[in-house]
């Protein structure tokens, strides 16, 4: 039967309807009373006093209400959750995850968690209303945990008409000898000791260090991972593991050359709610390498949106060529992620100036032949875009990749919802298409446009009338991604170039074939 | 620290392929580069690959003889030169490349000869 | 293909005394992301070849501070400001910046 449920917008929280709960106003020491009416949240400010006993976790601060017994924490910044437990700059698990908190909510299908206090997960065996919930992680939440001691964190999904568990694709924090690093490094405790420019790095128990805070003579040295050694270290929260060195024999310190743990392709996809001609509304989350990019014009004040682009690592965005034929400089140019909206900021969006930016050499603006630009992001260290739930690199695929033909795969971007429309999406948007064959690739179903090995073809093949929404790409979507699923992971095989009109029956969107590039992104980003 | 270990030295007839392989430690993610080397000669490089994405990038003069590729699962890259001739008598070295090729192997002398 | 012509072919030195050899390019190998891939090898007797210069003037780690690079466009130079007997051995040239990546035809170091 069908159940009217309220969603909290602010924590993402679910509740049944005439259910009531207490949430804390952000920035402010506001608690509102929230009801839920025929799936509206109804809230108003009411009284509140300290807790007589702790029940925050993490350095949550307790308050509860004057005149009934319900209580909410105001957690602090990197906590969410009831009672705090949630810990939202998790990026990995350790050993099982019988011990994770974060905030991943993706099955390895790509299938949505569903929130473990959802009425229908009543009577499996752990759900969010158990009395032991709290301590399992288990609440009103769809992140994923492990709280039977299974293999790893796992999480209810909807499928085939039922609810079942499915083990998540939350990054391990330690894949098998992998020396690497998760997040920004600080968990980091491999045996890396040279820094980015080949320089060795000096022992954190040397006598050159001595008045230096970050040393083995720390108290905390052993928490922060610094002993009798030279290994890359981040105890202070930097970017990434760093060390001291010696350079011109003065002391110094420098980033390390510690290869980050790929969390690329991985990402919390939430099924989209809105249709809209030619594809889907779409949240940023569910595409965290998708970038915006927005050049400035030597005509016009301000800035225009120009392009889609792809995060294909920290600094490196890759994008159409002919998105540049204007030859813009590149100080005109930024670019940002992290924004479902397309004009409007994003709370956790991150904006980039750029360095500079290299379109292929070859590419023929007659043809669209070799459609591939870069971009490196400016900053003032090696690293630009820090990864989060909705900022992360996608997989640059194998060289060897051959997907089936019609393989389903999709594509985001903020451009037009049809080829008339004068104006771009307000908002991301996704479609799902599937890979031609390259039989059907060719000139002679693109009307005689030239179509060469550098690129491919991918459509919905869905059947229906002149009024069919079939999902395209169309303007504006230009270089962004089209990815498809491989090895569980979200790799790019294609950048969006070029079409005949959007969304028409049997007439598929061009892609750059990204295959064919993959020496020529490699050698561009050389440090 | 990259450290990279290659294969023993080879004895091939004319005409016959040769696989030299070129095992990493350390930051396995950069690019490997096949130098060789003649005797009394100078270098010559062959190509590279990427040992993430396997994608390879080859000097003409070796196009259709060479082939390069990697096993990840045991962080080691292969350079296979087929239709061996005596001009091909070298050392065959592999280098590990960042930002120039800072690592190289200790060398692998292949010996073309009837 | 990028040539590569070094000079001397050959250079014999005195310890203490300082040493310079020539790489010219037959074209520019300024890389289209802006970079000059212009590295310099030392390959001593009986080993591999080792690092000492990247991208024209940076030295690698672990090299002496005598070795510096310098350079632009088509002409490089590396510069030892004192040789010492250690630093015998064949110095190369080498270009990243354009496929084929080439080397100097090499330059002898010996002790006179």
């Known amino acids: 039967s069908y159940q009217v449920i309220c969603r909290d917008e602010k924590t993402q929280m679910i509740y049944q309807q005439h259910q009531s709960w207490l949430r804390p106003v952000l920035r402010s020491n506001r608690v509102e009373y929230c009801w839920c009416n025929s799936g509206r949240a109804q809230c108003h400010s009411v009284p509140v006093k300290s807790c007589s006993e702790p029940r925050c976790f993490n350095g949550g601060t307790c308050q509860q209400a004057l005149y009934f017994s319900d209580f909410v924490c105001q957690c602090p910044e990197g906590f969410a959750g009831k009672c705090c437990e949630i810990d939202t700059r998790a990026t990995c698990y350790e050993d099982q995850g019988i011990s994770y908190r974060g905030t991943w909510s993706t099955a390895e299908s790509g299938a949505e968690c569903t929130n473990w206090n959802s009425s229908a997960l009543a009577q499996k065996p752990y759900s969010g209303r158990r009395p032991d919930a709290i301590r399992l992680g288990l609440g009103n939440h769809n992140y994923c945990r492990n709280p039977d001691r299974d293999s790893k964190p796992w999480c209810y999904v909807f499928k085939a008409g039922k609810y079942s568990s499915e083990f998540c694709s939350t990054p391990a924090c330690s894949e098998g000898n992998s020396d690497c690093y998760f997040g920004n490094g600080s968990a980091y405790r491999g045996t890396h000791s040279l820094t980015e420019s080949g320089a060795s790095c000096l022992p954190w128990n040397s006598m050159i260090l001595i008045g230096k805070v970050y040393t083995a003579q720390n108290p905390s040295a052993q928490a922060l991972g610094l002993g009798k050694h030279n290994y890359c270290r981040n105890p202070d929260g930097d970017a990434k593991p760093w060390c001291h060195v010696l350079k011109n024999r003065r002391l110094t310190w420098e980033y390390c050359d510690v290869p980050s743990c790929s969390t690329c392709g991985l990402r919390q996809y939430s099924q989209p709610q809105f249709r809209i001609k030619g594809g889907l509304f779409a949240d940023i989350a569910s595409h965290p390498w998708q970038a915006a990019i927005f050049a400035k014009h030597r005509r016009s004040p301000g800035e225009r949106f120009l392009c889609g682009g792809i995060l294909i690592s920290s600094c490196w965005i890759l994008s159409a060529a002919h998105c540049f034929q204007e030859r813009f400089p590149p100080h005109h140019l930024t670019v940002i992620l992290g924004r479902t909206y397309r004009v409007v900021p994003g709370e956790e969006e991150q904006k980039f100036e750029v360095e500079k930016y290299i379109v292929h050499k070859e590419f023929d603006d007659d043809t669209y032949d070799n459609d591939i630009a870069l971009l490196q992001l400016k900053s003032d260290s090696s690293r630009c875009a820090q990864e989060s739930s909705v900022v992360r690199t996608v997989c640059l695929p194998p060289a060897d990749l051959q997907l089936p033909d019609w393989t389903e795969c999709e594509l985001s971007g903020y451009g037009k919802h049809e080829a008339l429309s004068p104006f771009y999406s307000e908002r991301l948007k996704e479609a799902h298409v599937r890979l031609y064959p390259s039989s059907r690739c060719t000139s002679q179903h693109l009307l005689n446009r030239t179509v060469t090995d550098n690129m491919l073809c991918a459509g919905d093949t869905r059947s229906g009338g002149p009024q069919a929404n079939l999902h395209d790409a169309c303007q504006g979507d230009s270089g962004g991604p089209l990815v498809c699923l491989n090895d569980g992971r979200m790799t790019l095989v294609g950048i969006i170039s070029w079409g005949l009109g959007c969304g028409q029956k049997d007439v598929p969107g061009v892609y750059t074939k990204v295959t064919n590039y993959l020496d020529w992104i490699r050698d561009n980003m050389r440090p | 620290q990259v450290q990279l270990v290659q294969s023993g030295a080879e004895v091939k007839k004319p005409g016959a392929s040769v696989k030299v392989s070129c095992k990493a430690s350390?930051?396995?993610?950069?690019?490997i580069n096949w130098v060789r080397q003649a005797t009394g000669q100078g270098l010559e490089w062959m190509g590279r690959i990427d040992p993430g994405g396997g994608s390879t990038g080859y000097n003409q003069k070796f196009q259709g003889r060479v082939t390069m590729t990697r096993d990840t699962s045991i962080s080691t890259a292969y350079m296979e030169l087929s239709s061996l001739r005596s001009e091909d008598t070298a050392v065959y070295y592999c280098?590990?490349?960042?930002?120039?090729?800072?690592?190289w192997g200790q060398g692998t002398l292949v010996t073309v000869s009837s | 293909d990028v040539v590569m012509t070094q000079s001397p072919l050959s250079l014999p030195v005195t310890p203490g005394e300082p040493a310079s050899i020539s790489c010219r390019s037959s074209q520019s190998i300024v890389h289209s992301n802006g970079n000059t891939y212009l590295d310099w090898y030392l390959q001593k007797p009986g080993q591999s070849p080792q690092l000492l210069i990247y991208k024209v003037s940076n030295r690698a780690s672990g090299v002496p501070d005598r070795f510096s690079g310098s350079g632009s466009g088509t002409d490089f130079t590396l510069k030892i400001s004192r040789v010492e007997a250690e630093d015998v051995g064949v110095y190369y040239c080498f270009q990243g910046s354009h496929v084929p990546w080439t080397f100097g035809g090499g330059t002898k170091v010996e002790i006179k």
């Open positions: 280098a590990s490349y960042y930002y120039a090729m800072a690592y």
């Open positions: 350390g930051n396995t993610s950069y690019w």
